[in-house]
Interface confidence: low
């Protein structure tokens, strides 16, 4: 029931005011003006963004699970924000830890050669039966972001006359007959259909896809970045290893595909102040407009330090904009000397193709340890994962509405296939919350100086969280 406040005695009003002040401590505020959508509601919980009818309703809301959870998160967030700045000794220790980890966990040149040999061997086996096909290594083996146990990603290039499903079925048969491979199986229901097998000699798991061009383009981009920006590879390796420890890198269990972590590092390095990596598209391109960014398609890496782009003027955005411009022109007084801003904009997109640099002019002077800490802080406190899209193409932050991607917990745009959210496999609120919690724990752990042989539990969460991640229980929003 809504109280008619004009009928209250001063004493009652005092009581009401006292109650409202108490509510404010719980982030529940009286609305100055009632919302037209919620005409009965007198209060708003700014923490949960919930409209509340009256005092009783507010007290009931305070007891709700979601409000208590949000209060705890708010407290934790302010704790994390108030952590003291790390000392230079702390940052130096972090730098050493990241470099050591990258050396220990990453693949060596010898490991890479083994992986390349696997592709060579498999090429011989497959091309005996399918001479028009060729095999290529892609993924983390090629980018050098692979951990020692990472799978070997192999893609088959095939001529257009060949049928994709038939080809994979043939490959399955060929590999089954070869003595070089064991445990040969198909996974044709995966997002990217593959033949999976184990290389007998190295015991490495191979995942063989066909015509997976987009993944190969992303591989080329990340590999090129690893070559031109020295901090990129160790940061990605540390991030991937952390994700593996936390068991959030398993796509089949509703986690995030491992190459997403490389895109997340790239995005962070672009967004930090000052940035350490440039965005792939921007105002240096004549006529570039972020609102029409999808008219500019990324086409691959050139000279190992540029990304090639093409402008496609036949897109729907272009047609809509031209229609809008024509309408604007029709409404204008006829004056040939006056050029409208929209006219200039549409004429400006003269450049039909070009290349963007993968690095900035100024060399990076930031210690690796500091970047590691900043990376964790960025995804823990600075970037709202649930609201925005991780997009490495432009400097502007994209909202979910921009991409029309509402319900995903983490959205990461594939730079070469922009309609694709590569973190789509993370589709459970439970897992999302777990990932957020792991970020918080990691940031707290690395931001606070650790004593030798101190508390290891934060970085070894497998026991506690493994069960939590694969839990299939539904999550309530309250």
């Amino acid at each position: 029931t809504v109280i008619d406040e004009s009928a209250l005695t001063p004493e009652q009003r005092l009581g009401l005011k006292q109650a409202e002040e108490r509510l404010e401590r719980d982030h529940i505020f009286r609305l100055e003006k009632r919302s037209p959508e919620y005409t009965n509601c007198r209060y708003l919980c700014k923490l949960c963004l919930i409209h509340i009818e009256n005092i009783q309703g507010a007290h009931k809301h305070i007891k709700e699970k979601r409000h208590k959870k949000n209060i705890l998160e708010k407290q934790e967030e302010s704790e994390l924000r108030s952590l003291p700045s790390p000392s230079s000794a702390h940052l130096a220790a972090l730098s050493v830890a990241v470099v050591e980890l990258a050396k220990e966990q990453g693949i060596t040149d010898d490991d890479l050669r083994i992986r390349q040999d696997i592709v060579e061997e498999m090429s011989k086996v497959i091309m005996t039966f399918l001479p028009e096909c060729s095999l290529r290594l892609y993924g983390s083996s090629l980018t050098k972001f692979a951990l020692k146990s990472s799978d070997v990603n192999i893609d088959i290039k095939f001529p257009p006359k060949m049928n994709h499903p038939d080809l994979l079925i043939q490959v399955l048969g060929i590999l089954k007959k070869s003595a070089l491979y064991i445990d040969v199986e198909s996974d044709f229901h995966a997002k990217v259909p593959v033949v999976v097998c184990k290389d007998r000699k190295s015991a490495l798991l191979c995942r063989v896809s066909a015509g997976n061009d987009m993944a190969c383009l992303t591989t080329d981009l990340l590999a090129a970045l690893g070559k031109v920006e020295p901090v990129f590879t160790p940061l990605v390796l540390a991030f991937r290893y952390w994700a593996k420890l936390c068991y959030i890198d398993s796509q089949t269990d509703g986690g995030i595909p491992s190459y997403c972590f490389a895109l997340m590092v790239m995005f962070f390095l672009q967004q930090r102040k000052p940035p350490l990596l440039p965005c792939l598209l921007g105002s240096w391109i004549e006529g570039f407009d972020p609102k029409r960014m999808d008219d500019f398609q990324l086409k691959g890496i050139v000279e190992e330090k540029f990304v090639k782009w093409e402008y496609n003027s036949s897109s729907a955005t272009e047609k809509n904009l031209i229609a809008d411009e024509n309408k604007a022109k029709a409404d204008e007084p006829k004056d040939d000397t006056k050029k409208t801003e929209t006219d200039n904009q549409s004429n400006a997109a003269k450049a039909k193709h070009g290349k963007s640099p993968l690095t900035l002019e100024a060399p990076n002077q930031v210690p690796l340890g500091q970047l590691w800490l900043e990376l964790l802080k960025f995804y823990t406190l600075d970037f709202a994962l649930e609201e925005y899209v991780i997009c490495v193409r432009i400097q502007d932050i994209l909202t979910r509405e921009n991409k029309n991607w509402p319900k995903r917990r983490i959205a990461i745009e594939d730079p070469f296939s922009v309609k694709r959210n590569v973190a789509r496999s993370l589709n459970s609120q439970l897992v999302y919350e777990y990932v957020v919690e792991r970020f918080r724990a990691a940031y707290r752990y690395f931001a606070c100086p650790q004593k030798k042989g101190g508390n290891k539990s934060t970085m070894d969460p497998k026991k506690k969280e493994k069960g939590k991640l694969s839990s299939k229980k539904p999550v309530k929003s309250d």
């Epitope: 509703g254 509402p406 319900k407 589709n427 459970s428 609120q429 897992v431 999550v475 309530k476 929003s477």
Partner: nanobody, 118 residues
Amino acid sequence: QVQLQESGGGLVQAGGSLRLSCAASGTIFYDVIMGWYRQAPGKEREFVAGITYGGTTYYADSVKGRFTISRDNAKNTVYLQMNSLKPEDTAVYYCAVGDPTDPSYYYWGQGTQVTVSS
């Protein structure tokens, strides 16, 4: 992967009642809609009733006032209380769980037969 298990179907006389249940298991969004559809022999599958996570309900005109949909979010279960049943309600009733913003995220049960005799 999501599995849906319906129960509660059967043979009932016109004017009688039945309560269908559908339990969802597996990894599901916390904010999906749950609903019931039906398919009579030789006819297209049609929407019967749906309910949002928050409890807002929607019904097909043909069942309004007779059928009531409800859900237990903690148990991931949706129910359909069917009263004043008519012979034209005879069909296989399917439970569905889905995200209206993502057509690829839509799961169906195996169906449960409801037969209303006159």
